[in-house]
């Protein structure tokens, strides 16, 4: 049953019974002020009512104070991500206080029991914050709680219980089981801090979603749709870990939220931008690359405060590792005539040529279907900064390049043996960069030749800046 507590919320760690000579019971929640980047350095332990450690360990009352809150643990020890986060915070904010909330005895339980312990841990953090507020110069507005997985909900409880309002809570893939659909007072929610930003990296509609799917902050960012993270597939994991299994995939995707946050601290010159969108599918279509009216934001530490009336779901693509930044492009292709399209969707690829670099051949993901006499929108992204775009190569994959298409082509031929060549006509491609918000129009090199068919390519050159529309604001966000 859920772990019992005394009036102080303290508990003997039953997993590691103290030696007979030990009289002092370790508190179940400890506050470790990290005074060094070195994970081997013990730091200082703070406790409510004891001011000496604050002086001994040079706690800076006027500086930012970060509380790092771990989640459920099967191992009962701190994992590597925590040391990386501590180090990154020290690197970025040299004067800040970095406090690790150690609730391992209560987290090193059955997951469900650990969930039932989150409330008391939140209370302990709130008590610590209430005590610190009694000190001169300490401001709750300078407090930033960073909670991973179950720790995100602990942060929510702390923000809810504290006297006043903490400056910021960052939820790093808040835990899903037992919190999905829960009442706002029983999970992380926007009213737990002045600004609540959330990264969702392991959400699933099948199986058990380890990360919470629902939005729980002022901004909720879903990198790569919030589910399949690049570099975390079973094949990727199998390559690096003996007996790679689904648990390694879960850990990789769930923990990706932490690494995205660390990336935002250490690679501040390479910020990743997320874009507001109603859902992942619309984002994949390339519809949502606007920065107007706060519709885009930096992710992680550099996120600018947005307190929307309604929750803001935001999306972005990332690389498989640090630095995670990619460059997003919206491509609008107006197909003005179709010829003998049959039942199969064309498979298009684009190559972008820029002043700094050329992209790899990038697939155009057709989310639904190609519409004729209509503008079709696509999302493409590159890992490198191409600079200013100069030209675009559009290729229609020949049927023989895909077994599935070859089969459909063959079926199409059987039903319509005299079906002449398939083609479609494209005069121009309009491109918008998510990162710079620049709009460009590309026209076919030969105005007389606008048709493309399987196995062929079409070249487009920049023919004008803009889309003959009012320019949108740039996402160049003032970094804190």
């Amino acid at each position: 049953s859920p772990v019992p507590f005394g009036p102080e919320g303290r508990l003997e760690d039953k997993l590691h019974k103290p030696k007979a000579t030990q009289t002092e019971v370790k508190p179940s929640v400890r506050f470790n002020l990290r005074t060094s980047k070195d994970p081997e350095h013990e730091g200082c332990y703070l406790s409510v009512g004891h001011s000496q450690p604050l002086e001994d360990c040079s706690f800076n009352m006027t500086a930012k104070t970060f509380f790092i809150i771990h989640g459920w643990t099967m191992s009962g020890i701190f994992e590597n991500w925590l040391h990386k986060l501590v180090s990154a915070l020290h690197t970025r904010e040299k004067d800040a206080n970095v406090v690790v909330v150690d609730w391992l005895p209560l987290a090193h339980q059955l997951y469900t029991d650990a969930v039932n312990n989150t409330r008391v841990v939140g209370h302990s953090i709130a008590r610590m914050l209430d005590w610190l507020q009694e000190k001169d110069d300490f401001s709750l507005g300078n407090v930033h709680l960073i909670g991973y997985s179950l720790g995100a909900h602990v942060a929510g409880y702390a923000g809810n219980f504290v006297k006043g309002t903490v400056g910021r809570i960052t939820g790093l893939d808040p835990a899903g089981p037992m919190f999905e659909g829960a009442d706002i007072h029983k999970r992380l929610s926007p009213d737990d801090a002045d600004f609540v930003d959330v990264l969702h990296t392991y959400t699933r509609s099948f199986g058990l979603s380890i990360g919470i799917q629902m939005p729980v902050g002022h901004i909720d960012i879903y990198p790569n749709g919030g589910d399949f993270q690049p570099g975390c597939g079973l094949n990727d994991v199998l390559g690096s870990i003996a007996y790679g299994t689904i648990t390694e995939v879960v850990k990789c995707e769930h923990e990706r939220a932490v690494h995205l946050f660390v990336d935002s601290l250490v690679n501040q010159d390479k910020p990743s931008f997320a874009f507001q969108c109603t859902d992942s599918n619309r984002f994949k279509k390339g519809i949502c690359l606007s920065c107007r009216k706060n519709r885009c934001n930096s992710i992680g530490y550099n996120a600018k405060k947005m307190r929307n009336k309604r929750n803001s779901k935001m999306y972005l693509k990332t690389r498989a590792g640090m630095p995670f930044r990619v460059y997003h492009y919206q491509m609008k292709i107006h197909v003005f005539s179709y010829k003998n399209m049959g039942e199969i969707e064309p498979t298009f690829y684009v190559t972008l040529y820029g002043t700094n670099a050329d992209s790899q051949t990038l697939p155009l993901e057709i989310v639904e279907r190609i519409e004729q006499n209509a503008t079709n929108t696509f999302l493409v992204y590159t890992e490198e900064d191409l600079g200013d775009l100069l030209k675009i190569q559009l290729t229609w994959e020949g049927a023989s390049q895909s077994w599935y298409n070859l089969w459909k082509e063959f079926r199409s031929y059987l039903s319509q043996p005299r079906n002449p060549g398939r083609e479609l006509n494209i005069r121009r491609i309009r491109v918008k960069s998510g990162e710079t918000q620049r709009k460009l129009t590309f026209c076919t090199e030969d105005p007389e030749n606008t048709s493309i068919s399987p196995g062929r390519e079409l070249w487009f050159r920049k023919c004008r800046d803009g889309w003959r529309m009012k320019n949108e604001t740039s996402p160049t966000v003032e970094l804190p």
Epitope: L15, H16, M74, T112, D113, T245, V250
Partner: antibody, heavy 119, light 107 residues
């Protein structure tokens, strides 16, 4: 694929002890908890306890804490359960099974070891 | 400890039938309910975890539902290989506890 191979049947005398083994293969041994479950003839299942090789942490069902002792040998990827002071009540099939995190289910089971306590 | 009750200890059905086995917990277990199949040779397999999620490799004729304290396992189209004993288990809190089992046989 994931496999849990249990040791063979045991016939033991009352008051004696017995050590059962469960050898794991097909996954990272230190990343999953191994549970032990008891099934008396024609009856239901009873959870005995767990052993987590990643940190050697152990949890027992209060009912079995003076009966079972769980240990492991990481080098051979094997978890052991020693049953002491055996009585006829301990005659049963004992299963080891692997815990799935978050779902709190036992996704893979050994074939079971029959322990018969008889004079 | 949480008590798990499978009221029906034995159930007869014909091949092709839709069969439902129920399980009740003595308190709310927040969907942490798993179903296992024990075949006549003693082999135990996980069928359903977290109330309704199908374990990999389990045929889609098996499904689970429920919430709070009441849960059920349904086999939509009974096949010969489904003749076995079915156990429910709560994973909500320690000690984990199992239902007494429901033995499914052919009419």
């Amino acid at each position: 694929q994931v496999q849990l191979q249990q040791s063979g049947a045991e016939l033991v005398k009352p008051g004696a002890s017995v050590r059962l083994s469960c050898k794991a293969s097909g996954y990272t041994f230190t990343k999953y908890t191994i549970h032990w479950v008891k099934q008396r003839s024609g009856q239901g299942l009873e959870w005995i306890g767990w052993f987590y090789p990643g940190s050697d942490s152990i949890k027992y069902n209060e009912k079995f804490k003076d009966k079972a002792t769980l240990t492991a040998d990481k080098s051979s990827r094997t978890v052991y359960m020693e049953l002491s002071r055996l009585t006829s009540e301990d005659s049963a099939v004992y299963f080891c099974a692997r815990h799935e995190e978050y779902t709190n289910s036992l996704a893979y089971w050994g074939q079971g070891t029959l322990v018969t306590v008889s004079a | 400890d949480i008590q798990m009750t499978q009221t029906t200890s034995s159930l007869s059905a014909s091949l092709g039938d839709r069969v439902t086995i129920s399980c009740r917990a003595s308190q709310d277990i927040s969907n942490y309910l798993n179903w296992y199949q024990q075949q006549p040779d003693g082999t135990v397999k996980l069928l359903i975890y977290y109330t309704s999620r199908l374990h990999s490799g389990v045929p889609s004729r098996f499904s689970g539902s429920g919430s709070g304290t009441d849960y059920s396992l349904t086999i939509s189209n009974l096949e010969q290989e489904d003749i076995a004993t079915y156990f429910c288990q709560q994973g909500y809190t320690l000690p984990w506890t199992f239902g007494g089992g429901t033995n499914l046989e052919i009419k």
